[in-house]
Amino acid sequence: LQDPCSNCPAGTFCDNNRNQICSPCPPNSFSSAGGQRTCDICRQCKGVFRTRKECSSTSNAECDCTPGFHCLGAGCSMCEQDCKQGQELTKKGCKDCCFGTFNDQKRGICRPWTNCSLDGKSVLVNGTKERDVVCGPSPADLSPGASSVTPPAPAREPGHSPQ
């Protein structure tokens, strides 16, 4: 015998109080699969969480974090403070990029400056904690007497800056 509840589509529930009729999910609830005997309560995005996608009868609401914070966890269960440009989030919180690395975003990790000499180019603009170096023409391409910016000192390995 087929379970009559298996005919109930997403967005409904199998109502035992009404002879297993498929009833629509009540307001602020949803069922994302068919054959469910209850609808789940919609997530509410409150406080530091804001609504990215409204709840519907067939799918839960989705939250993200207010500006200055970013999501952690499955379904954005926690919010974590953004760092500034020129920093990365470590286990000790926001830390400045080590010499020879940069981060031009408010999240993510510091990345090594481009090594211009690998492409046979010179450094046109030095790198900073917030910006990569800008590579210029190769030294051979420079006209006699033209000078390039002194290349930066070799980058230390990330994570080994003096404290």
Epitope: Q44, K46, G47, V48, T66, F69, L72, G73, A74, S77, M78, C79, E80, K91
Partner: antibody, heavy 116, light 107 residues
Framework: QVQLVQSGAEVKKPGASVKVSCKAS????????MHWVRQAPGQGLEWMGA????????DYNQKFKDRVTMTRDTSISTAYMELSRLRSDDTAVYYC?????????WGQGTLVTVSS | DIQMTQSPSSLSASVGDRVTITCRAS??????LNWYQQKPGGAVKLLIY???RLHSGVPSRFSGSGSGTDYTLTISSLQPEDFATYFC?????????FGGGTKLEIR
């Protein structure tokens, strides 16, 4: 810096009510839920509920649902927790805490003693 | 409600010791696990959030790990200021629930 400062200790008789305040500073008060947690003497931490300062919406622990009321006054960045029909086993330290999915900042705690 | 079982409930250790506290949830909490420290004066401080992320200003001797239902807090080399009570807490579902606490005492 971000800080939560709670009101002072209270002594109440059984059957009375108590209202504890929690004043926030150093951040946008309306942008973060405020939760309340209590700790009876020698016991662990117990979550009581939360309020969204933006809307005034609340979530309460079923255990306290009929006795607790959480409110806020956004003009003075203050959250309140009122517990009614006090019993001797409500003697505890009551904490407020800011929420990011974890409680990153806590108030210093308010001791409420219920004694006849 | 999600039950959080913390062990041991008390622990004696010496300065320099490595200490591990465990927390078990009654269902999968998908890494939504936080650890707090409470000093004898009553002040509560966040140590670790989302299983392993160290809160700003917390010394790196503290670390967290785990997944599913089982989580641990490790202090790699105990310092005198670490003798306190530690609580785990789940953020997976309301009501938020805490472990019973682990009191860390000087041996």
């Amino acid at each position: 810096q971000v800080q939560l400062v709670q009101s002072g200790a209270e002594v109440k008789k059984p059957g009375a009510s108590v209202k504890v305040s929690c004043k926030a500073s150093g951040y946008t008060f309306a942008g973060f839920e405020m939760h309340w947690v209590r700790q009876a003497p020698g016991q662990g931490l117990e979550w009581m509920g939360a309020i969204d300062p933006k809307t005034g919406g609340t979530d309460y622990n079923q255990k306290f649902k009929d006795r607790v009321t959480m409110t806020r006054d956004t003009s003075i960045s203050t959250a309140y927790m009122e517990l009614s029909r006090l019993r001797s086993d409500d003697t505890a330290v009551y904490y407020c805490a800011r929420d990011l999915g974890y409680f990153d900042v806590w108030g210093q705690g308010t001791l409420v003693t219920v004694s006849s | 409600d999600i039950q959080m079982t913390q062990s041991p409930s008390s622990l004696s250790a010496s300065v320099g010791d490595r200490v591990t506290i465990t927390c078990r949830a009654s269902q999968d909490i998908r890494s939504n696990l936080n650890w707090y420290q409470q000093k004898p004066g009553g002040a509560v401080k966040l140590l670790i959030y989302y299983t392993s992320r160290l809160h700003s200003g917390v010394p790196s001797r503290f670390s967290g790990s785990g997944s599913g239902t089982d989580y641990t807090l490790t202090i790699s080399s105990l310092q005198p200021e670490d003798f306190a009570t530690y609580f785990c807490q789940q953020s997976e579902k309301l009501p938020r629930t805490f472990g019973g606490g682990t009191k860390l005492e000087i041996r």
